[in-house]
C-alpha cells in the first residue's frame, strides 16, 4: 500500500482543516488508514483522524483543531496499521479556505432597490472576521446569459443594487462567497442560493 498523491490540506481558519490524498489503488480509507496530527506546541496532544473515502482510491480527513493562530504548525503522520506511509507538516495560516457566508436574504421592500444581506461566517474574535470581502453572484433562472458578479470590497456583509439593473417580472437567484486578501486565501464555497421575483415600477415614458 502506497500514497500516490500526498495529502494536501486547507483550513477554515477556525476549527476544521480538511486533508485529501490518493492511494495507489482502491482503499477502504476508514478501516485501513489513520491520520495522526499534532500541533507543535508545548501544551498539545496527538489526535487521530479517521479518513473517509473520496472516490475509489481517494481519502479525505476532517481534522478538528484548536482556534488557529498565524504561527501554528501541525505535524501529520499517515499510518496503515503499523506502517508509516507518509510524514509531513501543515501550516493552517498558509492554506486557508474561508467558510461560506450564510443567511443570504434579499430584501425587496425598499423602493426600487434590492438589498442583499448575509452573515459573516466567523465570530468577532476570529482574525478573519474583519478581513473578509465578498463576491455576489446574481443570475436569471430564465436566461443563462443574464449572469453577473458584484465584488463587495467593503467589510459590511450587504449589497444594494437598483432593481432596474435587472429585468422586471422574472425570477432571479443570488449566492455569495468570501475570501480574505490578508492570508491570500482561496475563495470559499458559494452560499446556498436564494430566489426572488424581481418587479419594479417602470418609469413613465415622456412622448
Amino acid at each position: 500500500m502506497k500514497v500516490l498523491q500526498e495529502p494536501t490540506c486547507v483550513s477554515d481558519y477556525m476549527s476544521i482543516s480538511t486533508c485529501e490524498w490518493k492511494m495507489n489503488g482502491p482503499t477502504n480509507c476508514s478501516t485501513e488508514l489513520r491520520l495522526l496530527y499534532q500541533l507543535v506546541f508545548l501544551l498539545s496532544e496527538a489526535h487521530t483522524c479517521i479518513p473517509e473515502n473520496n472516490g475509489g482510491a481517494g481519502c479525505v480527513c476532517h481534522l478538528l483543531m484548536d482556534d488557529v493562530v498565524s504561527a501554528d504548525n501541525y505535524t501529520l503522520d499517515l499510518w496503515a496499521g503499523q506502517q508509516l506511509l507518509w510524514k509531513g507538516s501543515f501550516k493552517p495560516s498558509e492554506h486557508v479556505k474561508p467558510r461560506a457566508p450564510g443567511n443570504l436574504t434579499v430584501h425587496t421592500n425598499v423602493s426600487d432597490t434590492l438589498l442583499l444581506t448575509w452573515s459573516n461566517p466567523y465570530p468577532p474574535d476570529n482574525y478573519l472576521y474583519n478581513h473578509l470581502t465578498y463576491a455576489v453572484n446574481i443570475w436569471s433562472e430564465n436566461d443563462p446569459a443574464d449572469f453577473r458578479i458584484y465584488n463587495v470590497t467593503y467589510l459590511e456583509p450587504s449589497l444594494r443594487i437598483a432593481a432596474s439593473t435587472l429585468k422586471s417580472g422574472i425570477s432571479y437567484r443570488a449566492r455569495v462567497r468570501a475570501w480574505a486578501q490578508c492570508y491570500n486565501t482561496t475563495w470559499s464555497e458559494w452560499s446556498p442560493s436564494t430566489k426572488w421575483h424581481n418587479s419594479y415600477r417602470e418609469p413613465f415614458e415622456q412622448h
Epitope: 476549527s15 501544551l43 483543531m65 493562530v69 504561527a71 501554528d72
Partner: antibody
C-alpha cells in the same frame, strides 16, 4: 467581545491555600489554551502555568508541586489551586487566553500572603 | 531557559517624540513567537505586537515591531499621551515555555 472575569483572590497565611477562578466568554473556550500569569507588587510579569485544550499542563519551576491548573469547558472556566503558599507568591494573578502569546487578559486578582 | 533583557529600563520622552525599545534574548527566538505588551498602572497588560511584527487587532499603526534572532525592537513612531506606560516583550519556546522581559517604562520627560 472576549471577556475573562476573575474571582477568588484574598488574604491567606503562609502555608495556606487559595483557589482562583476565571470565567471566559465571547470565544470558544474549549478550543483555546489558557494561562495564569502573575505580577508581584512593583515587579514585572511572570508566567505561572498553562493548560492546553486537551488538558496538558505546564508550570513554572517556582510553583511546581504546589499549584494545580485545571479547566471546566462545560462552564467555560479556568482554575488555579494554590497550596503551600509563600510570601513570594504574593502578587496580582491574571488569567489569559492565548497560545504562543496572550491575546486577552482578565482584570487580575490580588493574592496577599501574610501572617 | 531563554532570558529576555529589555533596554533601557526607563525611557524619558515628550509627546510627539519617537520611542525605540529593545529586547535582547539570551539565545535565538523564532520571530513567530515574540510578542510585545503595554501595561498601564492598575490595568492588565494588553497585547500590542505578535509574531515580532504583526499588530494585534485595534492597535494603532504608530506601534511597530521588528527584529529577528536575538534582537527585537518595538517602535512608537510618535508618542501620544496615552502611550506612557510599561512595555514588556515575551517569547515562547517549545521546550522552555514562556518568558517575559523585565519591562521598559516610557515616562513623560
Amino acid at each position: 467581545e472576549v471577556q475573562l472575569v476573575q474571582s477568588g483572590g484574598g488574604l491567606v497565611h503562609p502555608g495556606g491555600s487559595l483557589r482562583l477562578s476565571c470565567a471566559g466568554s465571547g470565544f470558544t473556550f474549549s478550543r483555546n489554551a489558557m494561562f495564569w500569569v502573575r505580577q508581584a507588587p512593583g515587579k514585572g510579569l511572570e508566567w505561572v502555568s498553562g493548560i492546553g485544550t486537551g488538558g496538558a499542563t505546564s508550570y513554572a519551576d517556582s510553583v511546581k508541586g504546589r499549584f494545580t491548573i485545571s479547566r471546566d469547558n462545560a462552564k467555560n472556566s479556568l482554575y488555579l489551586q494554590m497550596n503551600s503558599l509563600r510570601a513570594e507568591d504574593m502578587a496580582v494573578y491574571y488569567c489569559a487566553r492565548g497560545r504562543y502569546w496572550y491575546n486577552n487578559w482578565g482584570q487580575g486578582t490580588l493574592v496577599t500572603v501574610s501572617s | 531557559e531563554i532570558v529576555l533583557t529589555q533596554s533601557p529600563g526607563t525611557l524619558s520622552l515628550s509627546p510627539g517624540e519617537r520611542a525605540t525599545l529593545s529586547c535582547r534574548a539570551s539565545q535565538s527566538v523564532s520571530n513567530s513567537y515574540l510578542a510585545w505588551y503595554q501595561q498601564k498602572p492598575g490595568q492588565a497588560p494588553r497585547l500590542l505586537i505578535y509574531g515580532a511584527s504583526s499588530r494585534a487587532p485595534g492597535i494603532p499603526d504608530r506601534f511597530s515591531g521588528s527584529g529577528s534572532g536575538t534582537d527585537f525592537t518595538l517602535t512608537i513612531s510618535r508618542l501620544e499621551p496615552e502611550d506612557f506606560a510599561v512595555y514588556y516583550c515575551q517569547q515562547y519556546d517549545h521546550s522552555a515555555g514562556w518568558t517575559f522581559g523585565q519591562g521598559t517604562k516610557v515616562e513623560i520627560k
